[in-house]
């Protein structure tokens, strides 16, 4: 039997054992987070699957993910939201130690999809493990990109109090308007709920004594935020090594003091 013709995309295919991984992550998450114990993981998987299975993978919409978003509804306490841009690992290491702060990937939906790729095929119930659309080379309305846009928008919309964002001071564009933070989250913070955005600019090392809060891209971020009637603050963080030290040894009393 000849294999059926399959669309060839430029991006890597669906992560192997994708359904099993999502289901297992859901079960693990709901076991660890008592406030999410009511969640039925089979329903979550069905809603996730329903967002992209048998749909043309370049024509996915935020609407497709609404059933999943509804099932994964979760709130973060005020002042405890941590956004990040181009510095994911450090942000996650931070919230692993500072347990009362949360990135999107610390929430159920972000946790389910973190580092995974997925797509289906039009008019079949199959998952495409060979290739999936690349955001640049194929299309932006692909299952993965639309998922992150959807959940990032929701995460930003529900944030309240003082919101923090961790930015990578080693990059040429410390604030990038084209990042998920710059294109989605910044514009969906709600001025009536969010008093301020505080940026933490993480320096490459102790030797870099510059004031990166003066960087033109940070000034651009400040302008965008201020125009939305949200106050903006920025801090230089010179000690990424302190993060790593605390991740290795979170009981160390030098890691337990306030931010």
């Amino acid at each position: 039997v000849l294999p059926r013709w399959r669309q060839q995309w430029s991006g890597s295919g669906t992560t192997s054992r994708f359904p099993e991984t999502v289901l297992a992550r859901c079960v693990k998450y709901t076991e660890v987070h008592p406030e999410m114990r009511h969640v039925d993981c089979q329903s979550v998987w069905d809603a996730f699957k329903g967002a992209f299975i048998s749909k043309y993978p370049c024509n996915i919409t935020e609407e497709d993910y609404q059933p999943l978003v509804k099932l994964g509804t979760q709130t973060v306490p005020c002042n405890k939201t941590l956004l990040w841009s181009r510095i994911k690992d450090l942000a996650h290491q931070f919230t692993q130690v500072q347990r009362d702060m949360f990135t999107l990937e610390d929430m159920l939906l972000g946790y389910l999809a973190d580092d995974l790729t997925w797509c289906g095929e039009f008019n079949t119930f199959e998952i495409n493990y060979q290739s999936c659309p690349d955001w640049r080379k194929d299309c932006s309305n692909n299952p993965v990109s639309v998922f992150w846009k959807t959940v990032s928008r929701r995460f930003a919309e529900t944030a309240c109090g003082v919101v923090h964002v961790m930015l990578n001071g080693s990059r040429s564009k410390i604030f990038d308007k084209n990042s998920t933070f710059g294109s989605v989250e910044v514009h969906n913070l709600q001025p009536e709920k969010v008093q301020a955005l505080e940026a933490w600019v993480i320096h490459g090392g102790r030797e870099d004594s510059r004031d990166l809060c003066q960087d033109p891209t940070i000034k651009e971020l400040e302008s965008i935020i201020s125009k939305r009637n949200i106050r903006f603050f920025c801090k230089n963080i010179y000690r990424p090594d302190k993060f790593l030290q605390c991740v290795k040894n979170p009981e160390d009393s030098s890691c337990l003091s306030g931010i």
């Epitope: 500072q98 603050f233 230089n236 963080i237 030098s254």
Partner: antibody, heavy 121, light 106 residues
């Protein structure tokens, strides 16, 4: 409780050398970066030098670079400051201080009582 | 390096509020700590990370930091608060302000 006790201060002639020690107790010494901070008579505080928890990285104020060497012996819970080519302007009380901090910043939560170094002919 | 400037002295009546400033170019972009030092004694940390109080430090001590000025506020100042106060920041190296002598009148 945390205790830092400095020793080794005294009177020394310009160009001379001195080695300060700081004996630490009441905490896991090898988990903390340590620093020396000095205070000239009637003046303010000046950071002198710092060393990472395992001694792999050392840092110096420009005013002492090339003349002072910071080191530590974690097996003895002791911090050292080797001071060479001493000048009159190095006259000060030298404090040993533990570097504490959150992920975001650093400060000195614990200080010794200090040891006086006088450089004079 | 950032330079931190403090007034040499501040006077306050007992029970009143004392404010000690620490100015520096865009100091709000850096975290600031404050130390109290009494004559013949080692410094004591009273505020860290702009506004956090270590355990054992009375609630009357508070801190703020924005723009070009960080401020240590002592509300209901007591005679025992008379001391020198130093601000400190970090930008890859530790920097201290010149110190402020707080005098409690009376």
């Amino acid at each position: 409780q945390v205790q830092l006790v400095e020793s080794g201060g005294g009177l020394v002639q310009p160009g001379g050398s001195l080695r300060l020690s700081c004996a630490a107790s009441g905490f896991t010494f090898s988990s903390y970066a340590m620093n020396w901070v000095r205070q000239a008579p009637g003046k303010g505080l000046e950071w002198v030098s710092g060393i990472s928890s395992w001694g792999s990285s050392t840092y110096y104020a420009d005013s002492v670079k090339g003349r002072f060497t910071i080191s530590r012996d974690n097996s003895k819970n002791t911090l050292y400051l080797q001071m060479n080519s001493l000048r009159a302007e190095d006259t000060a009380v030298y404090y040993c201080a533990r570097e504490d901090g959150s992920y975001m910043t650093d400060y000195f939560a614990y200080w010794g009582q200090g040891t006086l170094v006088t450089v004079s002919s | 390096d950032i330079e931190l400037t403090q007034p040499p002295s501040v006077s306050v009546a007992p029970g009143q509020t004392a404010r000690i400033s620490c100015s520096g170019d865009n100091i709000g972009h850096y975290y600031v700590s404050w130390y109290q030092q009494k004559p013949g004694q080692a410094p004591v940390l009273v505020i860290y990370s702009d506004s956090n109080r270590p355990s054992g430090i009375p609630e009357r001590f508070s801190g703020s930091n924005s723009g070009n000025t960080a401020t240590l506020t002592i509300s209901g100042t007591q005679a025992e608060d008379e001391a020198d106060y130093y601000c400190q920041s970090y930008n890859g190296t530790y920097v201290f302000g010149g110190g402020t002598k707080l005098t409690v009148l009376g």
